[in-house]
């Protein structure tokens, strides 16, 4: 049974374009993701020149940091990109939007780069083991959320080709020592643990040896017990839109969720002249919902083609997981075709055919 037409309106449906200045939008990204922050003007009007600030310091645009008046993009995010971000009016320094961004380690699945560090004949006649990729072994402490996959690697070489073994907290580590087992990829000099749990915390040591010597490296694993949360929706999405009659419109909704999210697009409607039921629940129709052939990516966009005046109104992106639901709403204003596009642009984005 899909969400019916009996649903209650959010406390403040107007606070769509992102958090109030006093509120922090909490966002979580994975390492390597693109951090996208959106801060549309309050009320849809012009907001003048803005500046993006991280932890109190103005952000300098670069190839990785793309700064726009209403949008900030940080490409290939890393731990260092975590922090408090705000968008401020340049002249008054008034905070328009406030975000708390956390970039978590998203370790590789254990299957990428396979074969890259396979044992190779170095051409050296004889020799003790040595690390072939020491720069890849810098990260001695790995903190990952529970349920992630972890891979420790110790790419090495020597002649004869050394053997690799693993210790946990100084003791021999074998598959039967953990639920779910382990994958030892000798060719890749790696140890893979899938779906880590708190009991996997500890010191992991690779021991690489041949008859000429032995080298070792110790990694510390910390498993973070994830605090479950309802889906997090990116601030400012969907954004209010102004469109010309007959044009096409797209609403976007970016959903972050640990558990598999269920996304729906709803349009608020009137029943007998009322937008809400007797108990304050809004009347909505479901425009788009998860189906057998729809991907999450497709559900993050609602496309309206050849819009009519009847398409004007309030649209909601509703996302749920096993913890709960989150929703953001936006308004579509449809203008007559003969209206000047420039005027319409004052109120938001215009999509002309």
């Amino acid at each position: 049974e899909s969400l019916g037409t009996e649903q209650r309106v959010v406390g403040r449906a107007a606070e769509v374009p992102g958090p109030e200045p006093g509120q922090q939008e909490q966002l979580v990204f994975g390492s390597g993701d693109a951090v996208e922050l959106s801060c549309p003007p309050p009320g849809g009007g012009p907001m003048g020149p803005t500046v993006w600030v991280k932890d109190g310091t103005g952000l300098v645009p670069s190839e990785r940091v793309l700064v726009g008046p209403q949008r900030l993009q940080v490409l290939n995010a890393s731990h260092e990109d975590s922090g408090a971000y705000s968008c401020r009016q340049r002249l008054t320094q008034r905070v328009l939007c406030h975000f708390s961004v956390r970039v978590t380690d998203a370790p590789s699945s254990g299957d990428d780069e396979d074969g890259e560090d396979e044992a190779e004949d170095t051409g050296v006649d004889t020799g003790a083991p040595y690390w072939t990729r020491p720069e890849r072994m810098d990260k001695k402490l790995l903190a990952v959320p529970a349920a992630n996959t972890v891979r420790f690697r110790c790419p090495a070489a020597g002649n004869p080709t050394p053997s690799i073994s693993w210790l946990k907290n100084g003791r021999e580590f074998r598959g039967e020592h953990r639920i779910g087992g382990i994958k030892l990829r000798h060719q890749q000099w790696s140890l893979v643990m899938e779906s880590v749990v708190p009991s996997d915390r500890g010191n992991y040591t690779c021991v690489v040896e041949n008859k000429f010597g032995s080298i070792r490296q110790t990694y510390t694993l910390d498993v973070l017990e994830r605090s479950p949360h309802r889906p997090i929706l990116q601030a400012g999405l969907p954004a209010n839109q102004t469109a010309v009659l007959g044009s096409d419109v797209e609403f976007h909704c970016k959903v972050y969720s640990d558990a598999q999210p269920h996304i729906q697009w709803l349009k608020h409607v009137e029943v007998n002249g009322s937008k809400v039921g007797p108990d304050g629940t809004p009347y909505v129709t479901v425009l788009k919902t998860a189906g057998a052939n729809t991907t999450d990516k497709e559900l993050e966009v609602l496309s309206l083609h050849n819009v009519t005046f009847e398409d004007a109104g309030e649209y909601t992106c509703l996302a749920g997981n096993s913890i709960g639901f989150s929703h953001h709403s936006a308004w579509l204003v449809v203008l007559p075709a003969e209206e000047e596009l420039v005027e319409a642009d004052e109120a938001g984005s215009v999509y002309a055919g």
């Epitope: 309106v9 606070e15 949360h229 809004p282 096993s322 709960g324």
Partner: antibody, heavy 119, light 108 residues
Framework: QVQLVQSGAEVKKPGSSVKVSCKAS????????ISWVRQAPGQGLEWMGG????????NYAQKFQGRVTITADESTSTAYMELSSLRSEDTAVYYC????????????WGQGTLVTVSS | DIVLTQSPATLSLSPGERATLSCRAS???????LAWYQQKPGQAPRLLIY???SRATGVPARFSGSGSGTDFTLTISSLEPEDFATYYC?????????FGQGTKVEIK
């Protein structure tokens, strides 16, 4: 109008289990979370856990983890809460409540089920 | 978990007086996720305020909510006889959902 009707009072022995039902009518059952909240005599309200029928997965407060099981039957619009290994401190009124995801509140409540644990 | 501390534990007032109930959170709570409930003996709780300041359907105008961050307030402008009850604040900002321990408003 949404209504939540719970099963009747129960008297249980320590160590046994109790299963309380909560039948919903007048709304869209599967798309809303149903939470269970208990109240010991003269005490405050305590959230135990909840379930959203369309997701099937229940979530539990740490305190009750391993002792409570929350399930839902979409065909009968009924949610269930089973508490095992009962002890005298579990004597309380158990409420089911609908979670409104538009207002982030418990907007409708069952009438409550008194569970008395006594030897 | 977010701990909600309500004060005072008991408020003794006469009908017609103004009641001010406080709810303090151990960490910041988005106001959209803060609610107040009223409970009378032998009855289930009843939703009064959602989103920190919006009155639920059928709730009299004498009830109002305010606050943000960690400090929230429920105000009853002029107590009616039927308002003497226990009031709970509750947050859904962070999992798990938590309630305050309650404030009992009794007749002086």
């Amino acid at each position: 109008q949404v209504q939540l009707v719970q099963s009747g009072a129960e008297v249980k022995k320590p160590g046994s289990s109790v299963k309380v039902s909560c039948k919903a009518s007048g709304g869209t059952f599967s798309s809303y979370a149903i939470s269970w909240v208990r109240q010991a005599p003269g005490q405050g309200l305590e959230w135990m856990g909840g379930i959203i029928p369309i997701f099937g997965t229940a979530n539990y407060a740490q305190k009750f983890q391993g002792r409570v099981t929350i399930t839902a039957d979409e065909s009968t619009s009924t949610a269930y809460m089973e508490l095992s290994s009962l002890r005298s401190e579990d004597t309380a009124v158990y409420y089911c409540a609908r979670v409104n995801h538009w207002t982030y509140t418990f907007d409708y409540w069952g009438q409550g089920t008194l569970v008395t644990v006594s030897s | 978990d977010i701990v909600l501390t309500q004060s005072p534990a008991t408020l003794s007032l006469s009908p017609g007086e103004r009641a001010t109930l406080s709810c303090r959170a151990s960490q910041s709570v988005s106001s959209s996720y803060l609610a107040w409930y009223q409970q009378k003996p032998g009855q289930a709780p009843r939703l009064l305020i959602y989103g920190a300041s919006s009155r639920a359907t059928g709730v009299p105008a004498r009830f109002s909510g305010s606050g943000s961050g960690t400090d929230f307030t429920l105000t009853i402008s002029s107590l009616e006889p039927e308002d003497f009850a226990t009031y709970y604040c509750q947050q859904m900002s962070n999992y798990p959902d938590t309630f305050g321990q309650g404030t009992k408003v009794e007749i002086k």
